[in-house]
Amino acid sequence: EPPTACREKQYLINSQCCSLCQPGQKLVSDCTEFTETECLPCGESEFLDTWNRETHCHQHKYCDPNLGLRVQQKGTSETDTICTCEEGWHCTSEACESCVLHRSCSPGFGVKQIATGVSDTICEPCPVGFFSNVSSAFEKCHPWTSCETKDLVVQQAGTNKTDVVCGPQDRLR
């Protein structure tokens, strides 16, 4: 009876279990009753990082110098190239597909430390009593407006992203 499942590092094809190609190699032809799976090594600028049945290897990532990228770790037949940014610049994401001079702190966060040539912007959440309603690479959290000092009352509470809204006091008639 033909198998319905195969062992690890095998795949089912034509009611038969064939060996997967090892990392760094691509599939040329499936196994048969009489022959093993045929695999070929990936080319110079290609890779496959898993046991696979892919017929094409993936291209190594290109670290585009026009985007400020450079190679941190050269790719192999089994691993992709890892990019990083030029000195003083910072990756915009884990994948490092582009570079920024410094990250900004989102609304609700203030700048704790402005970026330098070696370290990116350090953000901190605005604590109770403070807010930031902008994305910025230099602005700290701002204190809520003090309604009392203006002889007003709080009409709307502040949040980490919004200031309080002050209004006139109710006058007793």
Epitope: N66, L67, E86, L101, H102, S104, S136
Partner: nanobody
């Protein structure tokens, strides 16, 4: 496409003044925090000054505090840097930058040389 065109650089004697301008296009200038950064020969980029979108809040690096003034004219989509009491160590290519400052957003910069 973001375009930033810096101008106003030149050769100036120590103690002299220059006013740099940056003409912005390709984005809504009034919505963005803007920066001036500089790169001295053989050095990395240094953050010089920044201004919030409304022009009401500013930042200055310690090295230029009290000598440089950043400003903006949102009606003209232009950023300025007034540089007074210039020193030899202010010699650099000056770039204006929009937040976030993407590497490929850089303009050509304007060269400021302070020398006697």
């Amino acid at each position: 496409e973001v375009q930033l065109l810096e101008s106003g650089g030149g050769l100036v004697q120590p103690g002299g003044s220059l006013r740099l301008s940056c003409a912005a296009s390709g984005f809504t200038f009034r919505d963005y925090e803007m920066w001036w950064v500089r790169q001295a020969p053989g050095k990395g980029l240094e953050r010089v000054s920044a201004i919030n979108p409304q022009g009401t809040r500013t930042y200055y690096a310690d090295s230029v505090m009290g000598r440089f003034t950043i400003s903006r004219d949102n009606s003209k989509n232009t950023l300025y840097l007034q540089m007074n009491s210039l020193r030899a160590e202010d010699t650099a290519v000056y770039y204006c930058a929009k937040l976030p400052f993407m590497f490929d957003d850089r303009g050509q910069g304007t060269l400021v040389t302070v020398s006697s």
